[in-house]
């Protein structure tokens, strides 16, 4: 079920890549983020908390991500025609609870001017 | 129905502590985490903190760090909100508010009917 | 601290009447949730994620905005609907509750 758009701005472009913003609600302690290109899992993220608060972030499907305490970014690199998709961000909420997911995302458009290696 | 009872009205002398309960019932008290919210005469609302109940985790506000205590007792679905070093400032209506989540965010979807708390010499 | 201001302070107006209540936000925010209370009462949840109505509330109630300017809409006034009126922001620690807009009789 896709619970809608995502409310702020998903995706930036920089050479020639694109960071994939994907953001939870900072209470959030432990979480699973996985970003989907249309129905295919490419990336994933689970952030869990142990005792003594000890945090431990692990990637089954690993992209190269970065982890604030409101947002998961997944960046993907050499940017072509294909990358043009609808993108989601998957999220599972486990703690605190109640266990939520959520699916938000949106299409991501490909142009010329983002396009890793131009021919000139 | 999902329902959150909170203790009777308390009178503190400023310096002491207060424990306030908040006993869940009409749902599984694990699957939800707890806030506390006071709300003092006449004044607007504010958040003291959060505690899950599935992992005892806790979130204070940090005006409350230090001086604000959250435990839970599984056995009897109770939340504890204890507040110490009492002042006048604290006299307050203190109020339990179950978790939940939208899309994007999270909110207080089930209230408790409220605590007073009086701090006075 | 994300300071929500909340406008106007009191709303005069009759049954049947259009209500509109601002919340501005002293910094982006992602969403809003508008609380309802009445004298004595907790407080009880109308608007989530800035405007999902939540369970039993009336279709009167609508909710709008982005970024820091966000409304609560009620289409048309009904008696139990004077009360106060409450933004609460959960975006930004520590998550923060405007002043409140009184709506009161006319």
């Known amino acids: 079920e896709i619970n809608g758009s995502a409310n702020y701005e998903m995706f930036i472009f920089h050479n020639g890549g694109v960071q994939i913003l994907c953001k939870y609600p900072d209470i959030v302690q432990q979480f699973k983020m996985q970003l989907l290109k249309g129905g295919q899992i490419l990336c994933d993220l689970t952030k869990t908390k142990g005792s003594g608060n000890t945090v431990s972030i692990k990637s089954l499907k690993f992209c190269h991500s970065q982890l604030s305490n409101n947002s998961v970014s997944f960046f993907l690199y050499n940017l072509d025609h294909s990358h043009a998709n609808y993108y989601f961000c998957n999220l599972s909420i486990f703690d605190p609870p109640p266990f939520k997911v959520t699916l938000t995302g949106g299409y991501l458009h490909i142009y010329e001017s983002q396009l890793c290696c131009q021919l000139k | 129905q999902v329902q959150l009872v909170q203790s009777g009205a308390e009178v503190k002398k400023p310096g002491s502590s207060v424990k306030v309960s908040c006993k869940a019932s009409?749902?599984?008290?694990?699957?939800?985490?707890m806030h506390w919210v006071r709300q003092a005469p006449g004044q607007g609302l504010e958040w003291i903190g959060l505690i899950s109940i599935y992992s005892d985790h806790t979130n204070y506000n940090q005006k409350f760090q230090g001086r604000a205590t959250m435990t839970v007792d599984k056995s009897t679905s109770t939340a504890y909100m204890e507040l110490s070093s009492l002042r006048s400032e604290d006299t307050a209506v203190y109020y339990c508010g179950r978790n939940n989540y939208g899309n994007y965010g999270w909110y207080f979807d089930v209230w408790g009917q409220g605590t007073t708390v009086t701090v006075s010499s | 601290e994300i300071v929500l201001t909340q406008s106007p302070a009191t709303l005069s107006l009759s049954p049947g009447e259009r209500a509109t209540l601002s919340c501005s936000a002293s910094s982006s925010v992602s969403y809003m949730h508008w609380y309802q209370q009445k004298p004595g009462q907790a407080p009880r949840l109308l608007i989530y994620?800035?405007?999902k109505l939540a369970s039993g509330i009336p279709a009167r109630f609508s909710g709008s905005g982005s970024g820091t300017d966000f409304t609560l809409t009620i289409s048309s006034l009904e008696p139990e609907d004077f009360a106060v009126y409450y933004c609460?922001?959960?975006?930004?620690?520590?998550?923060?509750f405007g002043q409140g807009t009184k709506l009161e009789i006319k």
């Open positions: 994620d800035t405007s």
């Open positions: 009409g749902y599984t008290f694990t699957d939800y985490a």
């Open positions: 609460f922001q959960g975006s930004g620690y520590p998550y923060t």
